[in-house]
């Protein structure tokens, strides 16, 4: 490639998490080159025999790809010229977790960076009033989590209160025998209060809020991936 190997270019990755069964992104950027044909992108996974993905001379070169990644990877070919070497990983598997290396060769030099990729399942919780219950009860449900998360209830009025004695959480294995449905019930709920159902594992943290007043019910939920850092 016409380079001595002594020049190094800056390559930057971001640790990320993949939701199993869905598509994921392994992020990698580098100092761009003016000619696409001079750029080589290699993705490797520590411990895996073949390459995860290779892009060279403006196109994918998959003859050395490991079979565990066959048909599941793609780079954003139109963005390579501006320094985007990120990899799209289709149908994320639990076994995709591990350490990846984004290795770049350009006419300016070579560079690489590692990233930790975690895999699991995470989903947004939904909190509803359970009208079938004998007392005022809230029901928090999230369809897909793995590994098994913890569930903690909190309330705006009773800040710092421990609701473990008045709540019950169950985990039901989904049909694919990996992920689980999370159901948590909170009893003895008071009106004019905001309750939060917080679900967390080592990959993600999700919160479902519900505000119950005599006239209305307001819901809000959000999900945050943990340990996503450069």
């Amino acid at each position: 490639f016409g380079i001595s190997g002594r020049h190094s270019i800056t390559v930057t990755t971001v640790a990320s998490a993949g939701n199993i069964g869905e598509d994921g992104i392994l992020s990698c950027t580098f100092e761009p080159d003016i000619k696409l044909s001079d750029i080589v992108i290699q993705w490797l996974k520590e411990g895996v025999l073949g390459l995860v993905h290779e892009f060279k001379e403006g196109k994918d070169e998959l003859s050395e790809q490991d079979e565990m990644f066959r048909g599941r990877t793609a780079v954003f070919a139109d963005q390579v010229i501006v320094g985007n070497a990120s990899l799209r990983l289709k149908n994320v598997q639990l076994t995709d977790a591990g350490t990846y290396k984004c290795y770049i060769i350009t006419s300016k030099g070579k560079g690489n960076a590692n990233l930790e990729y975690k895999t699991g399942a995470f989903s947004m919780p939904e909190v509803n009033v359970d009208y079938n219950a004998s007392s005022e009860t809230l029901r928090c449900e999230a369809p897909r989590w793995f590994p098994q998360p913890t569930v903690v209830w909190a309330s705006q009025v009773d800040q710092g209160a421990n609701f473990s004695e008045v709540s019950n959480t169950s985990f039901e294995l989904n049909s694919e025998n990996v992920t689980m449905k999370v159901v948590s019930v909170l009893y003895n709920v008071t009106i004019n209060n905001t309750y939060s159902c917080m679900i967390e594992n080592d990959i993600a943290k999700a919160t479902g809020d519900i505000k119950v007043t005599e006239s209305e019910i307001k819901r809000r939920s959000h999900l945050q991936l943990l340990n996503s850092k450069a």
Partner: antibody, heavy 117, light 107 residues
């Protein structure tokens, strides 16, 4: 500490069998492909066999194909090499090695196999 | 099979010398080339992977370069602990193959 420790070497007659073991510690064994590499006395390095991280793929050097079998037991963090129909030219120090970034990044100390009548 | 040819097979050098070892592959192996150091009675040790990436813990006086069929291992300033045998290895296809080795001896 990341470590590989081979055992099972020894003196065996031509046509005999031997099973080598390689005990791994200090890393997630089940995430790594593993290799066997050998070195005949006073000679260079020769790759023998590899097994993928999940055991689904195995590759062998032509010189051992049909005689040697590589296997792994992730529950015991152990790699194996079953050697049958041994020949005098199989005499060597056998190393197990971890597959890191496209290379043998961690090596065991080796175990000597001597095939002689 | 891909043949790996190392040269020289042996060399004599002094402490502080710049040493260069070459490795040639019988066909294009891109950057899938590794270098190892082996001392008598010891297991080999990985120095360089992917042709030019320095393995963690390896002194920066070791460097690798090349792509395609021609590769070089350079020791910028030879130290007493560097006297050993060095091997290149291709990692692009099975069977994986090593060069014949280069023995670096004290002059």
């Amino acid at each position: 500490e990341v470590q590989l420790l081979e055992s099972g070497g020894g003196l065996v007659k031509p046509g005999g069998s031997l099973r080598l073991s390689c005990a791994a510690s200090g890393f997630t064994f089940s995430s790594y492909a593993m290799h066997w590499v050998r070195q005949a006395p006073g000679k260079g390095l020769e790759w023998v066999a590899v097994i993928s991280y999940d055991g689904s793929n195995k590759y062998y050097a032509d010189s051992v194909k049909g005689r040697f079998t590589i296997s792994r037991d992730d529950s015991k963090n152990t790699l194996y090499l079953q050697m049958n129909s041994l020949k005098t030219e199989d005499t060597a120090v056998y190393y197990c090695a971890r597959h890191g970034w496209d290379a043998f990044d961690i090596w065991g100390q080796g175990t000597l196999v001597t095939v002689s009548s | 099979d891909i043949q790996m040819t190392q040269s020289p097979s042996s060399l004599s050098a002094s402490v502080g010398d710049r040493v260069t070892i070459t490795c040639r592959a019988s066909q294009d192996i891109s950057n899938r080339l590794n270098w190892y150091q082996q001392k008598p009675g010891k297991a080999p040790k990985l120095l360089i992977y992917l042709a030019s990436s320095l393995q963690g813990g390896v002194p920066s006086r070791f460097s690798g370069s090349g792509s395609g069929t021609d590769f070089t291992l350079t020791i910028s300033s030879l130290q007493p602990e560097d006297f050993a045998t060095y091997y290149c290895q291709q990692a692009i296809s099975f069977p994986l193959t090593f060069g014949g080795g280069t023995k670096v001896e004290i002059k």
